[in-house]
Interface confidence: low
């Protein structure tokens, strides 16, 4: 039994980290393998991660870990019995990706205005909640050519757009996307969508 | 504000006992691991022992181990070391800190000592 | 035991002055590295940590790099409120070690 492809981790700076790696033939994940990753510190304990198949010959880890500082750094051990397959360290500062918001509304009762807000998914105390920036992505169910980004740039969860820079009387989706810089992280996944319909006045014609 | 005030030095004689305690304040005491350090007069810094947030692990240099005791009460917010069967080379500015905090392995608070004298 | 040698021991240095410290350990601490300021009759003060990152409220004109065996402190510019003994040490190995130490003096 050899590793193939070698474990890669990303962070949600919060509280789990998730390792994913491929082995060079089909393998029972869960029975066949362990992941034991322990914090370089004094006082710190080596915890095990019992990982789940991916595909055939891949396999994920969830590791869980209690808080997240910028100077933490892991030993990644993946073992077989006793047999070990590979060894490394993980660093979650330098490999991050956020949660994904939540909570994402559209707001259509403000005249003329559309309203989107959701929620940052750090609590207050995390680093990353005053750090995140967004991507709106609006879309219309009926026209796939109708597909838009709008980048939020400032802190606070949510973004007005004139409802009139959308066609009237269809249906758009919604979903939102966090990334921070400050840590140079991946974007994260995208939110649930959340689908509205369109409708404005149309400001009377000029002859 | 954070404080971290040590108390219980003194002047004991070789072979004798103290109990140094240290009040913390400004802080989650009960999610931070603890330490002690101490600093010989003139001399440079030596890690003393370790204390993770619930008291389940502990650490001790090799020159203190068998002798001295790290406990805490987070009832209290309060940080104990019990030294016992100590020596001349035990005489130290002794320094509560918090281990883990924030930052994995530094100290980022420190108390203003208390100075133990093992001497006859 | 990891030994952290850290040099100079003493150095004079002007005000304005770029001062540089350096901290060899005798095995790889990967950047499992802290400096701290003592002032004389004070307690010791967080400066850098993880190696080069800076502590809340610390003076960017403190500095740090390395990693692995080979430890830089710096401070760009001395001022006369840094006047003191600053220390390094690793927290990668079991014990914890630290520097002998190096004391700063303004010319």
């Known amino acids: 039994m050899k590793v193939l492809q070698e474990p890669t981790c990303v962070s949600d700076y919060m509280s789990i980290s998730t390792c994913e790696w491929k082995m060079n033939g089909p393998t029972n994940c869960s029975t066949e393998l362990r992941l034991l990753y322990q914090l370089v510190f004094l006082l710190s304990e080596a915890h095990t991660c019992i990982p789940e198949n991916n595909g055939g010959a891949g396999c994920v880890c969830h590791l869980l870990m209690d808080d997240v500082v910028s100077a933490d750094n892991y030993t990644l051990d993946l073992w077989a019995g006793q047999q070990l397959l590979w060894k490394g360290s993980f660093k979650p500062s330098e490999h991050v990706k956020p949660r994904a918001p939540g909570n994402l509304t559209v707001h259509t009762n403000v005249s003329d205005t559309l309203l989107l807000t959701w929620s940052n998914p750090y609590p207050p105390d995390n680093y990353l909640y005053n750090h995140l920036t967004y991507a709106v992505n609006i879309w219309s169910e009926n026209d796939p050519a109708d597909f838009r980004i709008y980048n939020v740039t400032y802190l606070e969860p949510s973004l007005r757009i004139a409802a009139s820079t959308l066609k009237s009387g269809i249906s758009y989706r919604a979903r939102v996307r966090a990334w921070a810089q400050c840590y140079n992280t991946t974007w994260s996944e995208w939110s649930p969508s959340t689908k509205w319909h369109n409708s404005y006045r149309e400001p009377f014609e000029q002859h | 504000e954070v404080q971290l005030v040590e108390s219980g030095g003194g002047l004991v004689q070789p072979g004798g006992s103290l109990r140094l305690s240290c009040a913390a304040s400004?802080?989650?005491?009960?999610?931070?691991?603890m330490s002690w350090v101490r600093q010989a007069p003139g001399k440079g810094l030596e890690y003393v022992s370790a204390?993770?947030?619930?008291?389940?692990?502990?650490y001790y240099a090799d020159s203190v181990k068998g002798r001295f005791t790290i406990s805490r009460d987070n009832s209290k917010n309060t940080l104990y070391l019990q030294m016992s069967s100590l020596r001349a080379e035990d005489t130290a500015v002794y320094y509560c800190t918090r281990q883990r905090g924030n930052y994995v392995g530094a100290m980022d608070y420190w108390g203003q000592g208390t100075s133990v004298t093992v001497s006859s | 035991d990891i030994q952290m040698t850290q040099s100079p021991s003493s150095l004079s240095a002007s005000v304005g002055d770029r001062v540089t410290i350096t901290c060899q350990a005798s095995q790889d601490v990967s950047t499992a590295v802290v400096w701290y300021q003592q002032k004389p009759g004070k307690s010791p003060k967080l400066l850098i940590y993880?190696?080069?990152y800076l502590y809340t409220g610390v003076p960017s004109r403190f500095s740090g790099s390395g990693s692995g065996t080979d430890f830089t402190f710096t401070i760009s510019s001395l001022q006369p409120e840094d006047i003191a003994t600053y220390y390094c040490h690793q927290y990668y190995g079991s014990p914890p070690t630290f520097g002998g130490g190096t004391k700063l003096e303004i010319k």
């Open positions: 204390i993770n947030s619930n008291g389940g692990k502990t």
């Open positions: 993880s190696a080069s």
């Open positions: 400004g802080f989650t005491f009960s999610s931070s691991y």
